[in-house]
């Protein structure tokens, strides 16, 4: 997704507009400590990474503090002084929002309103997936804010819910990542349950963006 050159595969993730993680997979340099050099401005000198990720004792990535930046990350992955991959990327197009926090459920007869804390930046979709033991697939509903009302539920059934946040593709493009799912919460007759007892092993949720 971040590109490949000279056998180097790159992945970029911008965690919640706070931290950028650049990882690489370089089969040609599998036993080499590649170094990561970067800048956030085209005019600055390159800085070297101070927070490397290691895999089997060798560098495999870098974590950078990048609070609320919408600029370009210029970077070079080097073997000694030799650049093996050089690129520049707008960081926001690799956004991974944080998982929803303070998820709450408000029941009213056959409907539930799921709310959580909206993130501080926009152009996001808040997706609720839910299913009862009688559903073969997860159902899904999403809104622009974390205030999602699901109607037509059966008060007698137990439902499992979880929530995640996604970046709008028309704004951020196709290379973003959905947030991690919130914890699964089970409800029946407007009351929280430890689990939906008769639930078979749930199928994988739909991961479509």
């Amino acid at each position: 997704q971040g590109g490949a050159a000279e056998g180097v595969q790159i992945q970029i993730i911008y965690f919640n507009l706070e931290t950028v993680q650049v990882t690489w997979n370089a089969s040609k340099y599998s036993r080499t400590n590649l170094t990561f050099h970067y800048r956030f401005n085209g005019d600055e000198a390159y800085d070297q990474c101070t927070n490397y990720l290691l895999q089997e004792g060798h560098t495999s990535g870098c974590l950078l503090d990048a609070e609320q930046r919408d600029d370009i990350l210029y970077f070079s992955i080097r073997n000694g002084t030799h650049p093996v991959f050089t690129a520049s990327r707008w960081m926001v197009y690799y956004l991974k929002p944080s998982s929803p926090k303070h998820v709450r459920f408000s029941w009213h007869q056959d409907a539930v309103t799921v709310t959580c804390s909206d993130l501080s930046y926009g152009d996001l979709l808040y997706e609720v997936q839910y299913r009862s033991p009688f559903d073969t697939e997860w159902q899904s509903k999403q809104e622009n804010t974390c205030n999602v009302t699901i109607e037509g539920l059966d008060a007698e059934k137990c439902y499992s819910f979880w929530v995640r946040v996604k970046a709008m593709e028309d704004v951020y493009g196709p290379d973003t990542y959905p947030s991690d799912w919130s914890e699964v919460t089970c409800w029946q007759r407007g009351e929280i349950r430890d689990a939906c007892a008769e639930t078979p092993t749930p199928p994988k949720p739909k991961l479509s963006k």
Partner: antibody, heavy 118, light 106 residues
Amino acid sequence: EVQLLESGGGLVQPGGSLSLSCAASGFTFSRYGMHWVRQAPGKGLEWVSAISASGGSTYYADSVKGRFTISRDNSKNTLYLQMNSLRAEDTAVYYCAKDKWGYAFDIWGQGTTVTVSS
Amino acid sequence: DIQMTQSPSTLSASVGDRVTITCRASQSISNWLAWYQQKPGKAPKLLIYKASSLESGVPSRFSGSGSGTEFTLTISSLQPDDFATYYCLQYNHYSTFGQGTKVDIK
């Protein structure tokens, strides 16, 4: 309809200044990085400058660094290029263009002509 | 800086021909390449991005391929509206255009 409309081009003497504007409509301007690209008469395309969606970060080709300044006013949906110390080689049609997810420039204006001549 | 070399510079073809334009990067750019069409007096129009993704609204006779340093734009059956100049653009590190390929009538 998504549209970009440049203005401000004209004839200027070497060493002079000019300010170009680009009015955006039909999309949420404040969400996207923007660029200026130029094309000298009978020549190919040359990227000139870019600015991030918030306007907080700017980027320039070496050929214009220190002479040109890109800026934007998201409240007015307008992109600007202030050109100082103009040279004959800056003569070109100047296009503003919208960034497409860091892959390319997807929407272009019709261009405005800048002629630097004594 | 990354240099982009297009070939040929000029290409004479007839309606219905299959046309291929190549673009070579001076270093690997993965698939960070776009193709544009420009007609005289008009702004460039995006055809292909990320080497092979067809921009919305662009006819399917246009296709792109390649990765690394070698890229190709193919027009499967040239139409009268396709006579124009075509440019490649690398967007891997900064932005650099190829010098252009003019497709004219044979």
